[in-house]
Interface confidence: low
């Protein structure tokens, strides 16, 4: 089990680092989006894992960006953000995120309504229970 956890972490690390770089190869990204969406988590240890991904990094004045699957809908009251940005992109995740052809990326607003927990613990619990 420990070996499986290490292997899973390695796969996730690679998926995060390569997120959005190849529109033709999105299977791993879509799977990870679905994990984040279902487990209500973001990144491996922290949402900050995404901030280092080159394709997601803005310049110093821009908001950090994360996959839209990181958004916590229940904590977001801003209907503009919900209707125009997040819901159209998250709606695809309801179909196991299989219809997506390119990475869906959302800016993190000043008030961070993204899942604050990384996915590591949830996935480790799932592995232990299965």
């Amino acid at each position: 089990r420990a070996q499986l956890e290490r292997s899973l972490r390695d796969v996730v690390e690679k998926t995060i680092q390569k997120y959005g770089t190849n529109p033709e190869e999105t299977a791993a990204e879509e799977s990870w989006d679905y994990v984040q969406f279902q487990l209500r988590c973001c990144g491996w240890h922290y949402p900050q894992d995404w901030f280092q991904v080159l394709i997601l990094r803005g310049n110093g004045s821009e908001a950090h960006r994360v996959p839209c699957s990181c958004y916590n809908l229940s904590a977001t009251n801003d209907s503009t953000i919900l209707d125009k940005v997040i819901l159209p992109q998250l709606s695809r995740l309801g179909h196991l995120a299989r219809s997506r052809h390119s990475a869906d990326i959302c800016a993190v607003p000043a008030e961070s309504h993204i899942y604050r927990e990384g996915c590591a613990q949830g996935l480790q619990k799932w592995l232990h229970n299965n």
Epitope: H45, Y46, Q48, Q52, A110, S112, R116
Partner: antibody, heavy 115, light 107 residues
Amino acid sequence: VQLVQSGAEVKKPGSSVKVSCKASGYSFTGYNMNWVRQAPGQGLEWMGNIDPYYGGTTYNRKFKGRVTLTVDKSSSTAYMELSSLRSEDTAVYYCARSVGPMDYWGQGTLVTVSS
Amino acid sequence: DIQMTQSPSSLSASVGDRVTITCRTSENVYSYLAWYQQKPGKAPKLLVSSAKTLAEGVPSRFSGSGSGTDFTLTISSLQPEDFATYFCQHHSDNPWTFGQGTKVEIK
């Protein structure tokens, strides 16, 4: 971004101390708040952190049971309370915000434990 | 707990020198490693996050490298304001731990 901590404290062994950290210049609930201490001439020791949005805490096992982290969202202030003080708790206590590494730190609060 | 071994514990160098500080962790921390600079009487300042990403406003003479268990902080050309103590820190698993520090002194 600014983190302003409360002033120096002198405490007796066995008592408690509560240090405050007032945040400004950013969204208080968007970052975790950590507490790190540094004994005179020594290295840095992470005590734990709190998520101001949900109130969840993570403690260093070494301090569990003695340290309590809280926040007051209305005033954007974090608090660290350390109980059952002993002489080896004499240190500078820092608050530091994070989403991952700690990017902004308070100026530090010296807590002296002496009989 | 993950142990952090920093070396050297102190070093003497001159302005313009290239300085390298290493940090070794007892377990794989992937890229969850930060470097901080601390001057006497001051709070630590974040220099590098995620092993190699320079924090905002940090001069380009600083660079970080490594992943897994072996990490390096390099100052390509030491400046007078760089004389300080440097700490590495992992933020991989609870509890976060720091290296014991490297004091960079004037030769």
